[in-house]
Amino acid sequence: RPSFSLVEDTTLEPEEPPTKYQISQPEVYVAAPGESLEVRCLLKDAAVISWTKDGVHLGPNNRTVLIGEYLQIKGATPRDSGLYACTASRTVDSETWYFMVNVTDAISSGDDEDDTDGAEDFVSENSNNKRAPYWTNTEKMEKRLHAVPAANTVKFRCPAGGNPMPTMRWLKNGKEFKQEHRIGGYKVRNQHWSLIMESVVPSDKGNYTCVVENEYGSINHTYHLDVVERSPHRPILQAGLPANASTVVGGDVEFVCKVYSDAQPHIQWIKHVEKNGSKYGPDGLPYLKVLKHSGINSSNAEVLALFNVTEADAGEYICKVSNYIGQANQSAWLTVLPKQQAPGREKEITASPDYLE
């Protein structure tokens, strides 16, 4: 049964398809494969803390250690990547904090940002100084393990020199890598000594070896690619938002809710209200009013602006976000001060009512 009563005839669904919103990432913890990772649950006053990964309960095992408010992952692998949450259960409510873990190699993100500097990798030699191939920029080759989300672009580089100028070819799992070996083929940029694969899929996993050779010698370097698959997830709200606020009577105030969602998020701003002098209906459920929701006629739904506030505007404001997978919500309190008191930004905490997640 629903755990609140809506005041007036306010629908919980948008009447028209909502517009897409700027989305914000939750905090991301990055580790290289093989490293250990420690994350502290950023929630206060937790009687009991439970952990989940991608919505599934997380228990201790030989690599995962749960001690109090700390989660430790030993010898991280790409399979440890995902959406984590810690939930603090208290006597009256519970609160959840989300974060991402990405066990990956940052330089395989696929951006061509460093291709502009590729010219220095193409070293021209004095024609008299014959020389076997050699690496010119080993820094760009240090990380051999690349864990990349599916659909991303991957770039492997083997900057080299030699005289005469060496040629470069690529092997996959020790065999000649042909264009027809993957959907969409791949690009080789000889000027930048790079192999580029767009929109990687699980079948792209494997060892990629660049072989650089001329008549005086041959060198090679192997990268390992792991493709991390994604799963759809419910909305994530940035921790600490909306933030508690205070203002004087007649002042203006803004609450902000930062949303991260793969799918179309439906954002609602809800406030506890009174009806006939009561905050609760006959069923014992609180009266709530939808102040704003995302839709065609709504401007940036991530922001709730209140103008010329009165004492009646004081109270708890809930940012509730849903998509087809599920919901998330966080709330903040507005304190309205008499005119003679100066307003101040309060400590940024979130409070979750017990009938919302």
Epitope: T52, G55, P232, A263, S322, Y324, Q327, Y355
Partner: antibody
Framework: QVQLVQSGAEVKKPGSSVKVSCKAS????????VHWVRQAPGQGLEWIGS????????SYNQNYKGRATITADKSTSTAYMELSSLRSEDTAVYYC???????WGQGTLVTVSS | DIQMTQSPSSLSASVGDRVTITCKAS??????IAWYQQKPGKAPKLLIY???YRYSGVPSRFSGSGSGTDFTFTISSLQPEDIATYYC?????????FGQGTKLEIK
């Protein structure tokens, strides 16, 4: 592993009601919507509605509003879909699915016949 | 409600063929579309979500693309086990509507 197990097949008379259950396991029941989808014999898929078990928020296809009632019991991790005023056209397989539509129940055949 | 118009309603192809199914939404839905495979007597199986993301464990021969109102689902090299009915579904706004389905058969 994630599982959604539905109740067994039902044969109902026109005008009566049917209540189909969907027991979830292997994931946090309150963290995902539960959707209900139906498929008439030889026909396509039709979304009936969904519920967010944590707070009971439900959403319905207007074609079923007033006839379909979706509920959830957090204590048993079970979702229910009740369809009233049954008619022969309601003969179909009824599926529950987790919020991401990645996991589905095995389906419950409801036959409406006089 | 957003209507999803799927075509063709049926198609016959040979093993190894490239197969393409299209879905057109009556309103813009950004990339909020999923593709499912359903075999007789079984529940649908999620293949693609958010237009182009392959769900975990789905073979790489299945892919999706498109944005706004026009979407495409492709099987790069048809396998015998791919014989099934395929559905698109928009998950942008309720009610979450499905296409009419495409029945895929082997020549």
């Amino acid at each position: 592993q994630v599982q959604l197990v539905q109740s067994g097949a039902e044969v109902k008379k026109p005008g009566s009601s049917v209540k189909v259950s969907c027991k979830a396991s292997g994931y946090i029941f309150t963290s995902y919507n539960v959707h209900w989808v139906r498929q008439a014999p030889g026909q396509g898929l039709e979304w009936i509605g969904s519920i967010y078990p944590d707070n009971g928020d439900s959403s319905y296809n207007q074609n079923y509003k007033g006839r379909a009632t979706i509920t959830a019991d957090k204590s048993t991790s079970t979702a229910y879909m009740e369809l009233s005023s049954l008619r022969s056209e309601d003969t179909a397989v009824y599926y529950c699915a987790r919020g991401d539509f990645a996991y589905w129940g095995q389906g419950t055949l409801v036959t409406v016949s006089s | 409600d957003i209507q999803m118009t799927q075509s063709p309603s049926s198609l016959s192809a040979s093993v190894g063929d490239r197969v393409t199914i299209t879905c057109k939404a009556s309103n813009g839905i950004s990339n909020d579309i999923a593709w499912y495979q359903q075999k007789p007597g079984k529940a649908p199986k999620l293949l693609i979500y958010s237009a182009s993301y392959r769900y975990s464990g789905v073979p790489s021969r299945f892919s999706g693309s498109g944005s706004g109102t026009d979407f495409t689902f492709t099987i790069s090299s048809l396998q015998p086990e791919d014989i099934a009915t395929y559905y698109c579904q928009q998950h942008s706004t309720t009610p979450y509507t499905f296409g009419q389905g495409t029945k895929l058969e082997i020549k």
